[in-house]
Interface confidence: medium
């Protein structure tokens, strides 16, 4: 038989079968049964969840479905000492104390095990003293706070609104200020849209809503007490002083209730410009304390919660492939929730069910496809990616050897405007060509194709008449697979037309307020977009794992690396007569991207021409695209982030969510002007241009002829 | 090579003025915040002025003891920081020397002497 | 204003003997904090900066060390052209403030 026959047992089995497949209301039904109690991570709630899941992936027809257990390090609130942040006066008594808990949303006042809003991993400290208010806590909010304000954090609380970046960044900026707390909060500026009522009566946040979420600086490492290896049985612990990532300080969340209270009374500077202001009616001073009349008032925080090893579950499914079964496309998504988990995580779980669901259904008729799909529901994603990472660090290799592709599947959706996409440049041309084939469920699109309502509403910045495709960052599942192992990787997800309030997410996003009613009430009642995420990520899948040649293409690396190389060249000539003074030529990294061009041109040249049914010569063909993307990791790492070996890609070392392009030759340039060591400094960009351009050598001698 | 050159410095009576110019070289002076620091004879070192990039919005900070009487300034197209000293005291007396950023290179120094 | 107070202020060495010099800021400071070197009639030139960090061109008998309010200068092996008035300073926050200097001197 030829491969193509193997895969396909009637010509009923394609892409089309599998997508017909795929029911909206299969999904509404899914996702009403995934988000009727909590599933916080080392839960008994989440592990009977993971054996509902395991069970029912069993039923759907996959091949095996196993759980994958790991004891790793997490963190819960003291259920006899809350956590709270009071003001105190001189005497030290507590003349106000923010809330303890979110007020229920209704129908759910009677649902036990409801975590109170809280940082994860926080220490546990009760600080007091004087407020700084630090806008986004951002790197230049602490530089107009230091540098052009003079106002110093060392030994003061500081209050921070939640959006922007990672909230993990903005605790780091804050120790590295010398802060001794940080009260994070939500501002109606970036959490509640203008003419949309809060919940329960629109999708906005109410005052005593808060966002929950950890506040780790992991970069990648996983498990804090085992970096690069899995928290199994036998695993070797450090101590909690060793461990990676914690924080340092008493970290808190709140809502815009309780920060009117400490806002309110701010005296000291005033913001220095309208970017500091947020939407309360409050001055936005930004201190350092109270003024005038409560000049002697303090605030002081009270942090009790615990950091303790516990069991994760994750669920691993194989649907075996017929003709490459020692090759991996996966698809997961996460299945640890901070509350109820209406959107973040089970919107995408919902998804990934009805998928499988398709899949088994294929496979029940005799169908199989070309290549292994392993598909993967994981656990404590919410606690810095554990559940995923863990289960990468113990098959890290036979996933170097064998991962095709890796598709990531959280949240579906954050808003229901328009498709958003972040992936490697090699599914550049799979997702056009998929999204092409689909009909958009927007309005006024009736009849066209997704491709087409996607490039309306989100044009791409430098390709007319192509939609937007972001580069992968971090802050998910993931980031293992592409950040450390080099796995080409995708996510797709239907979004808000909120482009300037990229990375604050929606408005309920980690309170309790995230329930199943708010997405079949406010956001997609239809779940219509639901089914059109289904069918991107799922026929993203079928693509990677049926298609006889991968679905990569390798020019479009080309044209980025030309992209990425322009950008950071046109970063450091803002510094001409330091590139004269330290030699610093760009010369070798266009050398490497012309080089990556010409042999990329050439490989898609032959991939046109060669002899697909000769398996050996399709079988080295495939192999040069599935390692390609394997040829951009660095085995030492970048500067001080081990775990982040991608030298194309990397997550921003001031916000985990957004990605950076060359992220070692940013990062040296970065503040460069503000380095005490210029020769040092300009060394050291030097040295990442060397291995920038070694790297991109290395990876376009991968695609040459082999012999 | 970075390198920065004062000039302007000498005798002046009490309560008169003074201009001092340090002329940069070697690196991209524009990016770079410039301080002026001063040294009376056999003392130790007191930090004056600086301003900022203009990036920065050209933001000057002062040391209190020349607030009101003394401005620091920057020609970006001359690679050149000022330090306009009015209303001079005698306890101004000292060697001026201009600093990069954090102090990491120094000029040679230009005498100011304030006497009657 | 945060002040900088250095100790001893002055020291008599050998050449070849290890000098340690102490900086005392009045409050944290992180590591902001450099040492710098000064010979009569020239002017001061940094040897260390962010508390441990030798700056270029600077030998490695040089040393800093320390953060938040104790900071240390040692000199291994000291050599003819060390003798000098070394002052530590810290950039932390406004005022920039130095330390009185110390004076090491031959014995």
């Known amino acids: 038989k030829s491969s193509n026959e193997a895969t396909n047992i009637t010509p009923k089995h394609n892409m089309k079968a599998f997508l017909d497949e795929l029911k909206a209301e299969n999904i509404k039904k899914f996702l009403y049964n995934f988000t009727q109690i909590p599933h916080l991570a080392g839960t008994e709630q989440n592990f009977q969840l993971a054996k509902q899941i395991q069970s029912q992936w069993k039923e759907f027809g996959l091949d095996s479905v196993e759980l994958a257990h790991y004891d790793v390090l997490l963190s819960y609130p003291n259920k006899t000492h809350p956590n709270y942040i009071s003001i105190i006066n001189e005497d030290g008594n507590e003349i106000f104390n923010t809330s303890l808990f979110e007020p229920p949303p209704p129908g759910y006042e009677n649902v036990s095990d409801i975590v109170p809003p809280f940082s994860a991993f926080s220490p546990q400290g009760m600080p007091e003293g004087d407020l700084v208010y630090v806008n986004y806590a951002r790197t230049e909010d602490f530089f107009k706070l230091e540098r052009d304000m003079k106002i110093n954090c060392s030994g003061k609380i500081v209050i921070a609104r939640y959006g922007k970046v990672f909230r993990g960044n903005k605790v780091k900026n804050a120790q590295l200020a010398g802060a001794k707390g940080v009260i994070l909060y939500s501002d109606p500026a970036d959490y509640f849209a203008p003419g949309v009522k809060s919940y329960p009566d629109g999708w906005n946040l109410p005052g005593g809503g808060v966002q929950r979420g950890n506040i780790l600086n992991l970069n990648g490492a996983g498990d804090p007490l085992t970096p690069g290896y899995p928290a199994n049985e036998y695993a070797y612990r450090r101590g909690i002083a060793e461990a990676v990532g914690l924080p340092s300080i008493p970290v808190h969340p709140i809502g815009y209730y309780d920060a009117q209270k400490l806002l309110e009374k701010m005296g000291g500077s005033a913001p220095p410009d309208s970017s500091w202001r947020g939407s309360l009616k409050v001055p936005y001073n930004v201190g350092p304390g109270f003024t005038g009349n409560f000049s002697t008032q303090k605030v002081k925080m009270h942090i009790h919660s615990t950091n303790e090893v516990t069991r994760i579950y994750n669920v691993i499914g194989t649907l075996r492939g017929a003709v490459e079964p020692d090759r991996y496309v996966i698809l997961g998504g996460h299945r640890d929730s901070w509350v109820f988990g209406g959107i973040d995580p089970q919107s995408g779980a919902a998804v990934v069910h009805e998928i499988v669901r398709s899949f088994g259904t294929l496979k029940k008729e005799g169908w199989r496809p070309r290549r292994t799909i392993l598909f993967a529901s994981w656990d404590a994603e919410e606690f810095g990616l554990l559940g995923s990472t863990e289960w990468a660090e113990e098959n890290s290799r036979l996933l170097q050897e064998r991962g095709v592709a890796y598709i990531n599947a959280d949240s579906s959706i954050e808003g229901n405007y328009t498709l958003r996409v972040d992936c490697t440049p090699l599914m550049y041309s799979l997702v056009h060509n998929l999204t092409k084939e689909l009909k958009s469920p927007d309005e006024g699109f009736e009849g066209k194709s997704l491709y087409e309502s996607w490039t309306k509403k989100s044009p791409s910045p430098e390709f007319s008449g192509m939609p937007r495709i972001s580069k992968l960052g971090s802050g998910n599942d993931f980031e293992v697979f592409f950040q450390r192992l080099g796995i080409a990787s995708g996510r797709a997800r239907y979004t808000k037309n909120w482009e300037t309030n990229k990375f604050s997410g929606y408005p309920l996003y980690h309170s309790v307020y995230e329930t199943y009613e708010l997405v079949e009430k406010f956001y997609d009642p239809m779940f219509k977009y639901h089914l059109t995420v289904a069918q991107v990520r799922g026929g993203m899948v079928f693509e990677l794992a049926n298609s006889i040649v991968l679905p990569f293409d390798c020019r479009d690396y080309a044209v980025v690396l030309r992209k990425y190389a322009d950008k950071i060249y046109s970063i450091s000539m803002k510094h001409p007569q330091e590139m004269k003074t330290y030699s610093v030529s760009f010369d070798s990294l266009f050398s490497a991207v012309k080089n990556f061009t010409e042999i990329a041109s050439k490989f898609s040249e032959r991939l046109q021409d060669f002899d697909k049914s000769n398996p050996i010569v399709l079988r080295m063909m495939n192999d040069q695209l599935m390692f390609l993307e394997r040829a951009f990791i660095d085995p030492l790492g970048l500067p001080d982030r081990p775990f982040y070996r991608h030298v194309i890609y990397a997550p921003s070392s001031h916000n985990k969510y957004a990605g950076e392009s060359f992220p070692g030759i940013y990062d040296a340039l970065f503040d460069i002007e503000s380095k005490v060591d210029p020769s040092k400094a300009w060394g050291e960009v030097k040295r990442q241009i060397y291995v920038a351009a070694f790297t991109v050598q290395a990876a376009a001698e991968t695609l040459s002829e082999v012999a | 090579e970075v390198k920065l050159v004062e000039s302007g410095g000498g005798l002046v009576q009490p309560g008169g003025s003074l201009k001092l110019s340090c002329a940069a070289s070697?690196?991209?002076?524009?990016?770079?915040?410039m301080n002026w620091v001063r040294q009376a004879s056999g003392k130790g070192l007191e930090w004056v002025a600086e301003?900022?990039?203009?990036?920065?919005?050209?933001?000057?900070h002062y040391a209190e003891s020349v607030k009101g009487r003394f401005t620091i300034s920057r020609d970006d197209s001359k690679n050149t920081v000022y330090l306009q000293m009015n209303s001079l005291r005698t306890e101004d007396t000292a060697v001026y020397y201009c600093?990069?950023?954090?102090?990491?290179?120094w000029g040679q120094g230009t005498t100011v002497t304030v006497s009657s | 204003n945060i002040v900088m107070t250095q100790s001893p202020s002055s020291v008599s060495a050998s050449v070849g003997d290890r000098v340690t010099i102490t900086c005392k800021a009045s409050e944290n400071v992180g590591t902001y904090v450099s040492w710098y070197q000064q010979k009569p009639g020239t002017a001061p030139k940094m040897l260390i900066y962010?508390?441990?960090n030798r700056f270029t061109g600077v030998p490695s008998r040089f040393s800093g060390s320390g953060s938040a309010t104790d900071f240390i200068l040692t000199i291994n092996n000291l050599q003819p052209e060390d003798f000098a008035t070394y002052y530590c300073g810290q950039s932390y926050t406004f005022p920039y403030t130095f330390g009185q200097g110390t004076k090491v001197e031959i014995k």
């Open positions: 301003i900022r990039s203009q990036s920065n919005n050209f933001a000057t």
């Open positions: 600093t990069r950023r954090w102090n990491n290179f």
């Open positions: 962010g508390a441990s």
């Open positions: 070697g690196f991209t002076f524009s990016n770079y915040w």
